[in-house]
């Protein structure tokens, strides 16, 4: 099989400050090196990029400084963290996965984790 | 509107060389890899090469390889392939393509026709 | 590389009537394949993606199924402009193929 499967969880809720993490593993058909992890928002039919990053196996996952994301790998598995969220930001978020170098290429992409993020409520106003 | 507009193309002798380019507008073009597709008259797709979002990571197919050279300038929103070393075989029309996020071909040029004849 | 295998080379059919496509793949491509459509002095347009969904503007006419070596393109019912070529594509792994296409004509 030539293909390149991702796997991911269905669902995630993040927590009260806006913060959601999940793991997304990919199971590899070549020996790659440089490897680009990319997560895509789908809402209705559109898809839009939120962040990406490049990374050699077995160096850290550096996104760009003003990314929502962060993130840690290790082998075929990278831990991602999305942060800033707010309620309108519930929807779909897909793992893509890119094996860059060296040739072939390879593409895969997730189904997607549903990530719900609920506004905490303002705390109420105190006499004392 | 989303567009893709080719140009470059003509007549060139066998051994010849040909730059075509491909102006992208209505969408962040550094944002994107682009491909170059051709196809020879009457004949079906053919994948030529692809080059990442920053240029760091580029690809040819077996039957290009050291003859053709993409590039791109994500300042001028612009496309380029260096063709050396042309032969009659290379005789097609050249479309350029945005490499979708989902992975697809999702936008394509109305293509530029590439002669290679003596 | 990856081959893909177009049948049938044409179909002649009449506007209203259903149109199958197949696209099969030399080994699995999972669901990292396309369809496009491609009318003569044209460029190709995506019409399908993923192998079943509809990439944005397509009518729902046009629906994509399969996974793995076998992949259907259906038009349920054929309009005017439908009457075209119709080429697979698999995006997973370089090089990226192409099925050699299927001419669907007006009967």
């Known amino acids: 099989c030539k293909a390149m499967h991702v796997a991911q969880p269905a669902v995630v809720l993040a927590s009260s400050r806006g913060i959601a993490s999940f793991v997304c593993e990919y199971a590899s058909p070549g020996k790659a090196t440089e490897v680009r992890v990319t997560v895509l928002r789908q809402a209705d039919s559109q898809v839009t990029e939120v962040c990406a990053a490049t990374y050699m196996m077995g160096n850290e996952l550096t996104f760009l400084d003003d990314s929502i994301c962060t993130g840690t790998s290790s082998g075929n598995q990278v831990n991602l963290t999305i942060q800033g969220l707010r309620a309108m930001d519930t929807g779909l978020y897909i793992c893509k996965v890119e094996l860059m170098y060296p040739p072939p290429y390879y593409l895969g992409i997730g189904n997607g984790t549903q990530i719900y993020v609920i506004d905490p409520e303002p705390c109420p106003d105190s006499d004392f | 509107e989303v567009q893709l507009l080719e140009s470059g193309g003509g007549l060139v002798q066998p051994g010849g060389s040909l730059r075509l380019s491909c102006a992208a507008s209505?969408?962040?073009?550094?944002?994107?890899?682009m491909s170059w597709v051709r196809q020879a008259p009457g004949k079906g797709l053919v994948w030529v090469s692809s080059i990442s979002s920053s240029s760091s990571y580029i690809y040819y197919a077996d039957s290009v390889k050291g003859r053709f050279t993409i590039s791109r300038d994500n300042a001028k929103n612009s496309l380029y392939l260096q063709m050396n070393s042309l032969r009659a075989e290379d005789t097609a029309v050249y479309y350029c393509a945005r490499v979708g996020l989902m992975g697809p071909f999702d936008i394509w040029g109305q293509g530029t026709m590439v002669t290679v004849s003596s | 590389e990856i081959v893909l295998t177009q049948s049938p080379g044409t179909l002649s059919l009449s506007p209203g009537e259903r149109a199958t496509l197949s696209c099969r793949a030399s080994?699995?491509?999972?669901?990292?394949l396309g369809w496009y459509q491609q009318k003569p002095g044209q460029a190709p347009r995506l019409l399908i993606y993923?192998?079943?969904t509809r990439a944005t503007g397509i009518p729902d006419r046009f629906s994509g199924s399969g996974s793995g070596t076998d992949f259907t393109l259906t038009i349920t019912r054929l309009e005017p402009e439908d009457f075209a070529v119709y080429y697979c594509q698999q995006y997973g792994s370089s090089p990226w193929t192409f099925g050699q296409g299927t001419k669907v004509e007006i009967k």
């Open positions: 209505g969408f962040t073009f550094s944002s994107y890899a």
């Open positions: 080994q699995s491509v999972s669901r990292y």
């Open positions: 993923g192998a079943s």
